[in-house]
């Protein structure tokens, strides 16, 4: 006996109660492939989720996050609260980054400032809660007598000639 269900297209299901007739998916359900024996319930975008694409008989709804939240996971399976730059989301909500750490985004965690000395460099611009430090030349490059393509002009006080 040939399985008549394989003839049922997407958007329908094979109704065993009706001699394997292809019946349309009921409202708020879909089947994205042919030959289905049931239709899947459409995803509902509620609360912090908003609808990006409505459900149809052949495809599920797609959700985004409302303003102030961002998507996490495949197909926006979660919405996570945004924080301000310089903060991270903790068990108690958005909290400022601890001294020595920064976050330049509305999501994610506070990360430690770059340790310039590990690369033999000096701190050119100090770090903040929102920004990493900027590393500059190594201290050796800045010391007197260090060779460079353009030697620095000698520092002198006004009215004094160089020795």
């Amino acid at each position: 006996l040939q399985d008549l269900c394989s003839n049922c297209p997407a958007g329908t299901f094979c109704d065993n109660n009706r001699s394997q007739i292809c019946s349309p998916c009921p409202p708020n359900s879909f089947s994205s492939a042919g030959g289905q024996r049931t239709c899947d319930i459409c995803r509902q975008c509620k609360g912090v989720f908003k609808t990006r694409k409505e459900c149809s008989s052949t495809s599920n709804a797609e959700c985004d996050c409302i303003s102030g939240y961002h998507c996490l996971g495949a197909e926006c399976s979660m919405c996570e609260q945004d924080c301000k730059q310089g903060q991270e989301l903790t068990k108690k909500g958005c909290k400022d980054c601890c001294f020595g750490t920064f976050n330049d985004q509305k999501r994610g965690i506070c990360r430690p400032w770059t340790n310039c000395s590990l690369d033999g460099k000096s701190v050119l611009v100090n770090g903040t809660k929102e920004r990493d430090v900027v590393c500059g030349p190594s201290p050796a490059d800045l010391s007197p007598g260090a060779s460079s393509a353009t030697p620095p002009a000698p520092a002198r006080e006004p009215g004094h000639s160089p020795q």
Epitope: R43, G47, V48, F49, C63, G73, M78, C79, E80, C94
Partner: nanobody, 122 residues
């Protein structure tokens, strides 16, 4: 069919109190963590309070000391007692399940109520 139905909202003067209720049906309420969230006109949606299945609670800094979340598993209901209300508490308040157990994060399997309006004004 899962349902969350909020009630208890209304108009109250600054300094006044309200108790919101959220009646749950269609799922095993006692094993779910629950949350209250709110959205004020022109403001971002924000979480207010959470309660774990074991009764442990979390509060947003903005409501700490004024709001109390509680649950009655026998009645499948979660409550939000709101005292010392301020005009900035004016919002639509939503009740929702809380699968992720991560503050500020909800997932696609969470259930949401339709919301109840709270207006704090003299």
């Amino acid at each position: 069919q899962v349902q969350l139905v909020e009630s208890g909202g209304g108009l109250v003067q600054p300094g006044g109190s309200l108790r919101l209720s959220c009646a749950a049906s269609g799922f095993t309420f006692s094993s779910y963590a629950m949350s209250w969230a709110r959205q004020a006109p022109g403001k971002d949606f924000e979480w207010v309070s959470y309660i774990y299945s074991d009764g442990n609670t979390y509060y947003a800094d903005s409501v700490k000391g004024r709001f109390t979340i509680s649950r009655d598993n026998a009645k499948n209901t979660v409550y939000l007692q709101m005292n010392s209300l301020k005009p900035e508490d004016t919002a639509v308040y939503y009740c929702a399940t809380w699968h992720t157990l991560r503050v500020g994060v909800w997932d696609e399997y969470d259930y949401w109520g339709q919301g109840t309006q709270v207006t704090v004004s003299s």
